[in-house]
């Protein structure tokens, strides 16, 4: 009986020859569960296991901590690949991180942090993260050290509010901190002054919410 | 639509007073504190004053403390910032921003600026003799 290939990421699967990008499946690391993930297989190289994309505000992402726990929406368009498993992958790997932002006036700008993990649910999928670079911000958007991860049923955050209800979307929110790249959808002239909006805010500043963004790791050995 | 307008800028004496308003559409003070900024040329933007209405708190700089005062007219929607014995140094563009009253950090009393997700297009100060 021959074998099923499996592949943890899309690093793996772009070193076995599948250079396409597109939707692929992915198995958890030391199990059988499987996810489905987009891989971009051409920026920088390829190789690309995209967590987290928003493009047009067709998926709702005020969710629970359930959902962003295992995922939701389509790969091809706008989705959340799941803490559960960006937490057990990168826990055995180091990681890269790179965040990929589109503003509404036409121009792109990325963060890209050289190491990446997530902590286990018992933490709350805290998020670690080192080696900040790239064109979005000298400064990191998500707070640092990094914070628990939190939603509108889950509140982990800083805040005597619960960021979450009041910002709309899961994230790592502080207090309620200068980014949150899962926040309100909203279109071009009306995304600004929004208190709930899509923001990374050492690139674009307050109140500013992004048109896309696409957040995306890769094996630091690739 | 959140919308902040500020007035009552202009050029002054030193030793002279002005008063900022910022007219606030689109939510109601009671639930929001309003910060004054102000931005002088190749400077960052710095914090001056902040309130929150619904508590009465104020937040002063230590460069303008004994000389600005912070008030809110909650029936108007309207906060303003009464300047006394101005400096030359408080020449800059000034701005008014809103941030949510909840947003604090817990054991926190104010709001860094990446908070304050509603501005204003700002008023120019000008203290020249």
């Known amino acids: 009986k021959e074998e099923k290939t499996t592949f943890r990421d899309c690093a793996e699967i772009f070193k076995s020859g599948l250079t396409t990008s597109g939707i692929y499946t992915l198995t958890f690391p030391n199990s059988t569960e499987e996810v489905k993930a987009y891989c971009d297989m051409d920026m920088g190289g390829g190789g690309w296991t995209v967590i987290q994309h928003r493009e047009d505000g067709s998926v709702d992402f005020q969710r629970t901590w359930k959902e962003y726990k295992e995922g939701f929406g389509s790969p091809l368009g706008e989705y959340w690949l799941g803490n559960e498993f960006v937490s057990q992958l990168t826990s055995g790997h180091r990681y890269v991180l790179k965040i990929q932002l589109k503003d509404w006036e036409g121009s792109e700008a990325h963060s890209l942090y050289e190491h990446f993990y997530l902590s286990g649910e018992e933490s709350n999928y805290r998020i670690h993260l080192t080696g900040l670079t790239g064109t979005a911000g000298k400064i990191s958007s998500i707070s640092q050290p990094g914070s628990d991860f939190s939603t509108k049923d889950s509140d982990n955050d800083k805040c005597i509010c619960k960021c979450s209800q009041m910002l709309t979307g899961g994230w790592w929110f502080d207090a309620c901190g200068p980014s949150n790249l899962n926040g309100q959808y909203y279109p071009q002239k009306q995304n600004t002054n929004k208190f709930n909006g899509i923001k990374w805010y050492y690139w674009k500043g307050s109140g500013y919410s992004l048109k896309a963004t696409t957040m995306m790791i890769r094996p630091a050995d690739f | 639509e959140v919308q902040l307008v500020e007035s009552g800028g202009g050029l002054v004496q030193p030793g002279g007073s002005l008063r900022l308003s910022c007219a606030a559409s689109?939510?109601?003070?009671?639930?929001?504190?309003i910060g004054w900024f102000r931005q002088a040329p190749g400077k960052e933007r710095e914090g001056v004053s902040a309130?929150?209405?619904?508590?009465?708190?104020?937040y002063y700089a230590d460069s303008v403390k004994g000389r600005f005062t912070i008030s809110s007219d909650n029936s108007k929607n309207t906060v303003y910032l009464q300047m006394n014995s101005l400096r030359p140094e408080d020449t800059a563009v000034y701005y008014c921003?809103?941030?949510?009253?909840?947003?604090?950090?817990?054991?926190?009393?104010?709001?860094?600026?990446?908070?304050?997700?509603?501005w204003g297009q700002g008023t120019l100060v000008t203290v020249s003799s």
């Open positions: 921003a809103a941030v949510p009253a909840g947003r604090l950090r817990f054991g926190e009393q104010w709001y860094p600026l990446y908070e304050y997700d509603a």
């Open positions: 689109g939510f109601t003070l009671d639930d929001y504190a």
């Open positions: 309130i929150r209405s619904s508590g009465g708190s104020t």
